[in-house]
């Protein structure tokens, strides 16, 4: 057969889905590897094929769309499962060829179980929510296109095995599940199921979510630096270790980039000809406000070391602020049998 | 170590009620759902519903619908099973019981009260 | 509701022996099933779920087994403190039932 443009296994859309569960799968080579869509490649004489490679197995073989009630079907540039069976797991190619062109691409599908308690290893997005803020929605994601507008499906919510009915601040409205007011407590993975009817049969979609309840841009401030401060002064003698936190609290905001430096005489320490090293910790409030300590540390410390200028600088979206650690040379203890008896004036 | 303490037995007129509660002591920081079951003298165990404190969430077996109402006041750790209009099948011990999340079905009958003698009598 | 169906509802054993409780779904549960242990004037004490995991420190010799409507409980060699009244209980479809019980009395 001629050559055709492999682009091998797309490991980045590693599609999973439940098991027993309608699924439909778009064929990637339109979404992300050709500038064209299906409809112009149609009309250009393009027919789309699909093939699979069993799980565990090494043999392409052609998808078999002659299965009872159609279980597997194409319709355009979708693949369709009604339902899905544990053993459509494997590698799927879709190619698309004439006589003159031919592009191809796979992709992984694993058809996963899930308990009573919809748990499962399905890797699950997570969508915050801002804590105190108001009323605050989810969707119910990744159902598009399974029926018409006109087949009105129930929609039940449930928190873990639990429906979610007479919660005192969450309420199922449809498709969508309204936070009041999120609280803590509502961290958690919440799961839509989606009930509709198709030619005689009951189809199931189960879709699930992680809820986390961040800090509200209400709350958000500039960076906090707690270290250094005026109440600390960092005291050495020459030879001595130099250790200076420098500890920043920065508030919750989404998608801003939090970050922490230090400057040595208003040069980054990389800059400079001193042997310092920085290390950092993160740790996180359970609202993800976010604490940042990078410590400098000079191992053996000289008198020059001391006399510099040692500041700490924090940057996020809210603002950038700096801080002055207080570093001096240590006053040597005086001798008391020469330094203290001149000072009495011995001869 | 997670206990549940229940009050103590009680005697009711049939037609009254009976609010028995359940204290829990060693909470999860994650929300949890409190259940209710019930065993009739000599009988086997039957399901009355639950409660997750932290969330205020709720249901009831079909057969207690319109009688039995389930409450926690999250600030003393505690939940209360009330059950109305008394007769004297449901004379039985009551028991709560819990798991430590809502994820996992099969541990939430975890840890069990000592149970409830609620006996119905005129 | 889905209906729970216990078997023997009296198994009588001799200490050291082994005995085999059944349980019966009326409809799939798939592997959500649980066991439990009641004695005389104790709460229930949960020994099995998932079909076939034992609860933190309930000994070896109790073990579960099966999945969809039928289920086994099986204790390998019978110990004096095991003489009790077993449940099974489904946890697939709400409302979560029991079975009738059975109890394993000293032969």
């Known amino acids: 057969s001629e050559r055709c443009d492999d682009w091998g296994l797309d490991t980045m859309r590693q599609i999973q889905v439940f098991e027993d569960e309608p699924a439909r799968i778009k064929c990637p080579l339109f979404e992300h590897f050709l500038k064209f869509n299906y409809s112009t490649a149609h009309s250009a004489g393009l027919t789309l094929i699909w093939y699979w490679t069993r799980q565990d197995r090494d043999l392409e073989e052609p998808i078999n769309f002659r299965l009872p009630e159609n279980r597997i079907s194409k319709e355009k540039d979708v693949l369709w499962f009604r339902p899905t069976l544990l053993n459509d797991t494997g590698n799927y190619t879709c190619m698309l060829r004439n006589t003159t062109y031919c592009s191809k691409v796979a992709f992984p599908l694993e058809v996963v179980q899930k308990d009573s308690c919809f748990n499962s290893p399905m890797k699950l997005p997570v969508h915050k929510l801002y804590i105190e803020y108001g009323i605050q929605r989810i969707t119910c994601p990744n159902v598009d296109g399974y029926f018409p507008s006109s087949v009105k499906p129930t929609i039940t919510w449930y928190m873990g095995c639990y429906k979610i009915q007479n919660f005192n601040n969450v309420i199922p409205e449809g498709m969508n599940l309204s936070f009041l007011i999120a609280l803590i407590s509502n961290n958690g993975n919440y799961t839509c199921v989606v009930t509709y009817p198709e030619n005689g049969r009951t189809f199931h979609l189960t879709r699930t979510l992680t809820v986390k309840v961040v800090g509200s841009p209400k709350n958000a401030v500039p960076p906090v630096i707690h270290s250094p401060n005026d109440h600390v002064v960092y005291e050495k003698e020459p030879g001595e270790e130099l250790l200076i936190p420098c500890t920043v609290y920065f508030s919750f905001l989404m998608d801003s980039r939090n970050e922490v430096w230090w400057t040595i005489d208003g040069k980054k320490p990389d800059d400079i000809t001193i042997d310092v090293t920085i290390n950092e910790s993160i740790s996180h409030s359970r609202t993800e406000d976010e604490t940042r300590t990078q410590i400098l540390s000079i191992k053996k410390v000289t008198s020059e070391d001391l006399k510099r200028s040692y500041v700490c600088h924090a940057r996020s979206a809210k603002g950038e602020v700096a801080k002055a650690a207080k570093v001096k040379q240590k006053v040597p203890a005086p001798r008391y049998t020469v330094e203290l008896a001149c000072g009495f004036g011995a001869t | 170590q997670v206990q549940l303490v229940q009050s103590g037995a009680e005697v009711k007129k049939p037609g009254s009620s009976v609010k028995v509660s359940c204290k829990a002591s060693?909470?999860?920081?994650?929300?949890?759902?409190i259940q209710w079951v019930r065993q009739a003298p000599g009988q086997g165990l039957e399901w009355m519903g639950y409660i997750i404190p932290s969330l205020g969430g709720y249901d009831y077996a079909q057969k207690f619908q319109g009688r039995v109402t389930i409450t926690a006041d999250e600030s003393t750790s505690t939940a209360y099973m009330e059950l109305s209009s008394l007769r004297s099948e449901d004379t039985a011990v009551y028991y709560c019981?819990?798991?430590?999340?809502?994820?996992?079905?099969?541990?939430?009958?975890?840890?069990w009260g000592q149970g409830t003698l609620v006996t119905v009598s005129s | 509701e889905i209906v729970m169906t216990q078997s023997p509802a009296t198994l009588s054993v001799s200490p050291g022996e082994r005995a085999t409780l059944s349980c019966r779904a009326s409809q799939s549960v798939s592997s959500n099933l649980a066991w439990y242990q009641q004695k005389p004037g104790q709460a229930p004490r949960l020994l099995i779920y998932g079909a076939s995991t034992r609860a933190t420190g309930i000994p070896a010799r109790f073990s579960g087994s099966g999945s969809g409507t039928e289920f086994t409980l099986t204790i390998s060699s019978l110990q004096s403190e095991d003489f009790a009244v077993y449940y099974c209980q489904q946890y697939n479809n709400w409302p979560w039932t029991f079975g009738q019980g059975t109890k394993v009395e000293i032969k």
């Open positions: 060693g909470s999860p920081a994650e929300p949890y759902a």
């Open positions: 019981a819990r798991g430590q999340t809502l994820y996992d079905a099969g541990r939430q009958f975890d840890i």
